[in-house]
């Protein structure tokens, strides 16, 4: 039994780090493998993560952590019974993938303006709470070419756009994702999408 693709890990900078790897053949990850992780810190203990299958030869493990600070560094040991398959380390603050925003809502009752709001996925005491910026994706269900991205570079989790920038009388969907420049994070996953019917009064044309 050998590791084909070494574990790579990302942290949500809150309570979970996710490690993925591939074995050299079909593996029952949860029964055959264990990923041990230990904070490099005085009097810390090793903790065990039981991996799940992620495709035939792929495994994924969700490492539970109390919280994360920039100094944290973990040793990782991948075991198959008594055999050490791989040894590595992981610094969560250098591999951050933020949590996805939630509760995306489209408010259509503000004159001819669309107000999109969503929730910051972090509590106020988390460092990332005040460092997230967002990308909002809006697309038409009827026209695949009608696809746009709005970059929200301010901290407030909201976006206002004129309803008239979208076509009237058709359905649109929106989703939002986040990233944090301070830790050079990857983008989060997209939030679940929300749907609305776009309708607004066309201005009278004067001849």
């Amino acid at each position: 039994m050998k590791v084909l693709q070494e574990p790579t890990c990302v942290s949500d900078y809150m309570s979970i780090s996710t490690c993925e790897w591939k074995m050299n053949g079909p593996t029952n990850c949860s029964t055959e493998l264990r990923l041990l992780y230990q904070l490099v810190f005085l009097l810390s203990e090793a903790h065990t993560c039981i991996p799940e299958n992620n495709g035939g030869a792929g495994c994924v493990c969700h490492l539970l952590m109390d919280d994360v600070v920039s100094a944290d560094n973990y040793t990782l040991d991948l075991w198959a019974g008594q055999q050490l398959l791989w040894k590595g380390s992981f610094k969560p603050s250098e591999h951050v993938k933020p949590r996805a925003p939630g509760n995306l809502t489209v408010h259509t009752n503000v004159s001819d303006t669309l107000l999109l709001t969503w929730s910051n996925p972090y509590p106020p005491d988390n460092y990332l709470y005040n460092h997230l910026t967002y990308a909002v994706n809006i697309w038409s269900e009827n026209d695949p070419a009608d696809f746009r991205i709005y970059n929200v570079t301010y901290l407030e989790p909201s976006l206002r756009i004129a309803a008239s920038t979208l076509k009237s009388g058709i359905s649109y969907r929106a989703r939002v994702r986040a990233w944090a420049q301070c830790y050079n994070t990857t983008w989060s996953e997209w939030s679940p999408s929300t749907k609305w019917h776009n309708s607004y009064r066309e201005p009278f044309e004067q001849h």
């Epitope: 009097l43 090793a46 109390d66 600070v69 920039s70 100094a71 944290d72």
Partner: antibody, heavy 125, light 112 residues
Framework: EVQLVESGGGLEQPGGSLRLSCAGS????????MTWVRQAPGKGLEWVSS????????YYADSVKGRFTISRDNSKNTLYLQMNSLRAEDTAVYYC??????????????????WGQGTTVTVSS | DIVMTQSPLSLPVTPGEPASISCRSS???????????VDWYLQKSGQSPQLLIY???KRASGVPDRFSGSGSGTDFTLKISRVEAEDVGFYYC?????????FGQGTKLEIK
């Protein structure tokens, strides 16, 4: 009431051995790291050794490394310090102390918040 | 090893007056923001040491609020706002970020 009670001290000749014990009560003993600190007569405090809650991690002062062994029996809520090859400079009052909560991924530190009454070790011929 | 240096080593104080003890570490004991691994202990004559302050500025349970700790990185201070007769004894700072834990030499607080 959270309490630590040391025992096992006494008079021993240079080169001899002693085993100190520290019985814990009033807290979940296995969840906490434990530490030994000593104090030579008329001197300040000196850290001796520490052990994590499960016993998997141990640390020693250079002055005792290779001679002293820290261990614990969580089923008996007891901490030990096996002292071999004793020297005159090991003469001191030995205290055990409750250290950080070590079952969490990052050990949670609240200081050495409970200390035993101390047990006296005298090494003399 | 991290060396902890206390000053003064002797501190005569009039009851009701404030007192301050300094502790300097030879390297930073800051792990992350809010986590300075420095404690302060008081050892009264014939007794075991007792914890006063942990993580630089957190008062231990049951410790009177006249005791406070401050500082970050390498420089730390224990302050007693109004010294009482029962506060006499030896005060020690200690770092517990890395092994070996190291103590300051101790400061003897006595009543004038």
């Amino acid at each position: 009431e959270v309490q630590l009670v040391e025992s096992g001290g006494g008079l021993e000749q240079p080169g001899g051995s002693l085993r100190l014990s520290c019985a814990g009560s009033g807290f979940t003993f296995r969840d906490f790291a434990m530490t030994w600190v000593r104090q030579a007569p008329g001197k300040g405090l000196e850290w001796v050794s520490s052990i994590s809650g499960s016993g998997s991690s141990t640390y020693y002062a250079d002055s005792v490394k290779g001679r002293f062994t820290i261990s614990r029996d969580n089923s008996k809520n007891t901490l030990y310090l096996q002292m071999n090859s004793l020297r005159a400079e090991d003469t001191a009052v030995y205290y055990c102390a409750k250290d950080r909560l070590s079952v969490t991924v990052r050990p949670r530190y609240y200081g050495l918040d409970v200390w035993g009454q101390g047990t006296t070790v005298t090494v003399s011929s | 090893d991290i060396v902890m240096t206390q000053s003064p080593l002797s501190l005569p104080v009039t009851p009701g007056e404030p007192a301050s003890i300094s502790c300097r570490s030879s390297q930073s004991v800051l792990y992350s923001i809010g986590y300075n691994y420095v404690d302060w202990y008081l050892q009264k004559s014939g007794q075991s040491p007792q914890l006063l302050i942990y993580l630089g500025n957190k008062r231990a349970s049951g410790v009177p609020d006249r005791f406070s700790g401050s500082g970050s990185g390498t420089d730390f201070t224990l302050k007693i706002s109004r010294v009482e007769a029962e506060d006499v004894g030896f005060y020690y700072c200690m770092q517990s970020l890395t092994s070996p834990y190291t103590f300051g030499q101790g400061t003897k607080l006595e009543i004038k």
